[in-house]
Amino acid sequence: ACDTATCVTHRLAGLLSRSGGVVKNNFVPTNVGSKAF
């Protein structure tokens, strides 16, 4: 899977959207790598 910073950001945004924003506070693009997905 794509692991550029932009891909990670968009993937995280999708995850946040699907979860209704119910994720840990530190689950932000600069804190997670592609492995988090």
């Epitope: 995280l12 932000v28 600069t30």
Partner: antibody
Framework: EVQLVQSGAEVKKPGASVKVSCKAS????????MNWVRQAPGQRLEWIGD????????NYNQKFKGRATLTVDKSASTAYMELSSLRSEDTAVYYC????????????WGQGTTVTVSS | DIQMTQSPSSLSASVGDRVTITCKAS??????VAWFQQKPGKSPKALIY???YRYSGVPSRFSGSGSGTDFTLTISSLQPEDFATYYC?????????FGGGTKVEIK
């Protein structure tokens, strides 16, 4: 309101260096990557690199490796792009840009900084 | 580096026209493509990400499609404020690269 406010226009001589700043507000600066892009007159957009303000990790376009340096001042929520050994071909508008998720999911860009390299 | 080839480089159209801009990547970039609109003297404005998703606030007349190497931006009914230059960008691989732009002019 998310804003990326860049420093003012610069005129430099060939061989000199320039440092452009990008002050972020309206979101948590350390949560999102900051990109730097430039556009020479009449040319396509060109990606310079990105920086993770959280751990200061960087990715550079090989074309600028060794000449471009991306840094941040977390306490001031400001990103910097320094370009050294300037030549006339570096005359361009330089932009900072960041894709923010919270408070609004959008790709925000600074207003641009014009750098002119001329003897 | 991945080359992004946009066509046409310019086009003339009238208000109400349907406009299609294409972008071809030199290798597979999955759906990791964005589209931007830029007006003279202004910063680029993001329209589309992940090939087909509109950012909030972007009018529904803008749509994107494609995957792999071939991508399209369509403006279903051109409005006066849409006359601008449009760029595609791939972010599947470093360095991110942009197309050469398509200037949409008034006929």
């Amino acid at each position: 309101e998310v804003q990326l406010v860049q420093s003012g226009a610069e005129v430099k001589k060939p061989g000199a260096s320039v440092k452009v700043s990008c002050k972020a507000s309206g979101y948590t600066f350390t949560d999102y990557y900051m990109n730097w892009v430039r556009q020479a007159p009449g040319q396509r957009l060109e990606w310079i690199g990105d920086i993770n303000p959280n751990n200061v990790g960087t990715n550079y376009n090989q074309k600028f490796k060794g000449r471009a340096t991306l840094t941040v001042d977390k306490s001031a929520s400001t990103a910097y792009m320094e370009l050294s050994s300037l030549r006339s071909e570096d005359t361009a508008v330089y932009y900072c840009a960041s894709i923010i998720i919270v408070p609004n999911y959008f790709d925000y860009w600074g207003q641009g900084t014009t750098v002119t390299v001329s003897s | 580096d991945i080359q992004m080839t946009q066509s046409p480089s310019s086009l003339s159209a009238s208000v109400g026209d349907r406009v299609t801009i294409t972008c071809k990547a030199s290798q597979n970039v999955d759906t990791n493509v964005a589209w931007f609109q830029q007006k003279p003297g202004k910063s680029p404005k993001a329209l589309i990400y992940s090939a087909s998703y509109r950012y909030s606030g972007v009018p529904s007349r803008f749509s994107g499609s494609g995957s792999g190497t071939d991508f399209t931006l369509t403006i279903s009914s051109l409005q006066p404020e849409d006359f601008a230059t449009y760029y595609c960008q791939q972010y599947n691989n470093y360095p991110y690269t942009f197309g050469g732009g398509t200037k949409v002019e008034i006929k």
